[in-house]
């Protein structure tokens, strides 16, 4: 979902960290949504 940045070597070198960060933020968002849902 970030096609243009793939031309930058930095993107390649940080890819694993980027994926981890995105997975983590998705988990946090899902947990936040669950908390909100549970409180309704």
């Amino acid at each position: 979902d970030n096609p243009s940045l793939s031309i930058d070597l930095t993107f390649h070198l940080l890819r694993t960290l980027l994926e981890l960060a995105r997975t983590q933020s998705q988990r946090e968002r899902a947990e936040q949504n669950r908390i909100i849902f549970d409180s309704v």
């Epitope: 940045l5 930058d8 930095t10 390649h12 070198l13 960060a21």
Partner: antibody, heavy 118, light 112 residues
Framework: QVQLVQSGAEVKKPGASVKVSCKAS????????MKWVRQAPGQGLEWMGV????????FYNQKFKGRVTMTVDKSISTAYMELSRLRSDDTAVYYC???????????WGQGTLVTVSS | DVVMTQSPLSLPVTLGQPASISCRSG???????????LEWYQQRPGQSPRLLIY???NRFSGVPDRFSGSGSGTDFTLKISRVEAEDLGVYYC?????????FGGGTKVEIK
């Protein structure tokens, strides 16, 4: 041609914050990560962190985590680096830099001298 | 963190003669993709750093062919075949294979 133009020199008191800007031109700003490197007087180079201007992903050198904030304003192709709780040993020239598909620091700004003194 | 150790700290040279700078990494800097992201930068007095070499031995565009890089694993070298006056300054090696990215302490090339 690729150009990175930084803001002017700053003098700050210990405990204050400083925000350095880096205006990019000559390429599509969102196509390349922006890095920040600093150099204390007479010392070597130290990588501070990197920001993805497209999606805002940021990776900081742990040494600066909690004191440094990197942001971008895509509308004016400008990256910012803010360093808080300044100490005298933060006196340094701060550089922004951009890579290519082959190397990490191919293009550099002219540097911004930040002096921390009481 | 990967410590990058350069030697010598200072390198007095005679113009027209060769010069060699060594850079050793505290651990292997071969990336998981098989590449070695070892770069060399030149910093002339009062100027911003300038990229010379990337991935150990590749000259960046506009860099004169008197500059060459070599090495593997943990041992790397930057060579200047014939030093010119414009080559005086500080040279830094850098590794981008492991986070945090780290620079060597620098080698100052000066007139003997």
């Amino acid at each position: 041609q690729v150009q990175l133009v930084q803001s002017g020199a700053e003098v700050k008191k210990p405990g204050a914050s400083v925000k350095v800007s880096c205006k990019a031109s000559g390429y599509t700003f969102t196509d390349y990560f922006m890095k920040w490197v600093r150099q204390a007087p007479g010392q070597g180079l130290e990588w501070m962190g990197v920001i993805n201007p497209n999606q805002g992903d940021i990776f900081y050198n742990q040494k600066f985590k909690g004191r440094v904030t990197m942001t971008v304003d895509k509308s004016i192709s400008t990256a910012y680096m803010e360093l808080s709780r300044l100490r005298s040993d933060d006196t340094a020239v701060y550089y922004c830099a951009r890579g290519t598909d082959r190397a990490l620091f191919a293009y550099w700004g002219q540097g911004t001298l930040v002096t921390v003194s009481s | 963190d990967v410590v990058m150790t350069q030697s010598p700290l200072s390198l007095p040279v005679t113009l027209g003669q060769p010069a060699s700078i060594s850079c050793r990494s505290g651990q292997s800097i071969v990336h998981s993709d098989g590449n070695t992201y070892l770069e060399w930068y030149q910093q002339r007095p009062g100027q911003s750093p300038r990229l010379l070499i990337y991935k150990v031995s590749n000259r960046f565009s506009g860099v004169p062919d008197r500059f060459s890089g070599s090495g593997s694993g943990t041992d790397f070298t930057l060579k200047i075949s014939r030093v010119e006056a414009e080559d005086l300054g500080v040279y830094y090696c850098f590794q981008g294979s492991h986070i945090p990215w780290t620079f060597g302490g620098g080698t100052k090339v000066e007139i003997k």
